[in-house]
């Protein structure tokens, strides 16, 4: 019986959300000794890389210099060691942002609330879209999808300090083409709570993270990036 190699990791650097006309690199990490990597886009072969020397390289990069809506979609990669191919990677949803318009994000009852208070975000965009996405900065990349003619509601329910952080929203023209990001809304959750165990505050990226959707590229964080992206994309799907 023909065996297959473990699937590779796939992720985008600096981020899977790419402003139009900006560059992005799709990374595929397989095994040392892999002689060929293939990148597939929407099910078809998109690019091939043959690392040299293969025994010293376990990762390849596919560079996209100018992001646009035609390049946005689902990517996967595979690699080959000898005649043996790997399982395909998870799907990477590459999203083009800064398309068309900018939504407005607001939060009720306000940006500062008491622990346990019910909070709802509202994302509004007057142009033709019916899908909206709410994202919270931080490696766990909380993504919610909402629908509405010009506005979507995102009820967070009773909040805890784990909900603290900076939120932005996007209008989505399709799964892979998003609007400009809204202005950020910082949610502050205060409250002295007796005998209540709360989740810790979510780690967040530096303040400039969202200007260009950059993730901090620290050594050893590549797999975190892949998981971060994958978590968000699963929620998108």
């Amino acid at each position: 019986q023909q065996q297959t190699l473990p699937k590779p990791f796939i992720w985008a650097e600096p981020h899977f959300m790419v402003p139009k006309e900006k560059q992005v690199t799709i990374c595929c990490q397989g095994n040392y000794g892999a002689v060929e990597y293939q990148l597939h886009f929407e099910g078809s072969l998109f690019a091939v890389d043959r690392p040299k020397p293969p025994e010293r390289i376990n990762k390849v990069k596919f560079y996209i210099p100018d992001m646009n809506s035609r390049m946005a979609g689902q990517y996967s990669c595979i690699y080959r060691v000898g005649e043996l191919w790997s399982e395909p990677s998870n799907l990477l949803d590459l999203v083009v942002t800064e398309m068309y318009d900018t939504p407005t994000l607001s939060v009720h009852p306000g940006p500062e609330v008491i622990s346990g208070e019910k909070v709802t975000f509202y994302c509004r965009l007057d142009t033709a879209t019916s899908m909206f996405l709410l994202l919270k900065e931080g490696r766990s990349s909380h993504v919610q999808r909402g629908y509405g003619k010009v506005q979507a509601e995102f009820p967070l329910g009773p909040v805890t300090t784990a909900h603290r952080g900076t939120y932005r929203c996007f209008g989505s023209y399709n799964n892979h083409a998003w609007s400009f990001p809204s202005e950020p809304v910082k949610l502050l959750v205060t409250g002295d709570i007796e005998n209540t165990s709360l989740a810790p505050e979510d780690p967040t990226f530096p303040a400039d993270t969202w200007g260009t959707y950059l993730l901090t590229t620290e050594t050893g964080l590549q797999k975190d990036h892949a998981l971060w992206d994958h978590t968000a994309q699963n929620l998108l799907r």
């Epitope: 607001s106 009720h108 009852p109 306000g110 940006p111 500062e112 609330v113 008491i114 622990s115 346990g116 208070e117 019910k118 009773p158 805890t160 502050l188 205060t190 409250g191 002295d192 709570i193 007796e194 209540t196």
Partner: antibody, heavy 116, light 107 residues
Framework: QVQLVQSGAEVKKPGSSVKVSCKAS????????MHWVRQAPGQGLEWMGG????????SYNQKFKGRVTITADKSTSTAYMELSSLRSEDTAVYYC?????????WGQGTTVTVSS | EIVMTQSPATLSVSPGERATLSCRAS??????LHWYQQKPGQAPRLLIK???QSISGIPARFSGSGSGTDFTLTISSLEPEDFAVYYC?????????FGQGTKLEIK
Amino acid sequence: QVQLVQSGAEVKKPGSSVKVSCKASGYTFSEYTMHWVRQAPGQGLEWMGGISPNIGGTSYNQKFKGRVTITADKSTSTAYMELSSLRSEDTAVYYCARRGGSFDYWGQGTTVTVSS
Amino acid sequence: EIVMTQSPATLSVSPGERATLSCRASQSISDYLHWYQQKPGQAPRLLIKYASQSISGIPARFSGSGSGTDFTLTISSLEPEDFAVYYCQNGHSFPLTFGQGTKLEIK
């Protein structure tokens, strides 16, 4: 319909404490925070603090911190505001108000007079 | 804390005329600004929420505008029952703060 009914007027000595109640009806008590706002005679409105009844989270105006305690009893849909170490300048009407974004419903007010 | 400043302190207007009340925040509060009306011996009543959103049961002559630091409450044609004290409130940050009030009196 939403109603907030407060306890009756109180006359207190300086240095003592007062506890005012606010019974809510007409909505799910735990789904909204309850706040306390006071108004001294001839003066404006002053926020004292609020509570989230579902988990007991509170937020206080630093001006009152240490003297004010806000609690809630979900079983009776009642919020309480206790103010200690009373002084003459605490003479005021005390209101409870539901925060439904803004303060959309208010109690009728409780007059607390601090006098020796 | 965010300081809310209302002007004028007292506004004298005749019934049927238009009244414009101002409220300024010491820092930007976006549209997290609410307006209340209070009559003697009564609790405050919500008039406008989030700077411009109308409230069910409140007459259409009451409207609000503004964003950031400067806000306005407009009463298009004053009725006798509109003479009262009006307060704006910061709903953005704790401590939640109120303006000192504008007394609307009959001219």
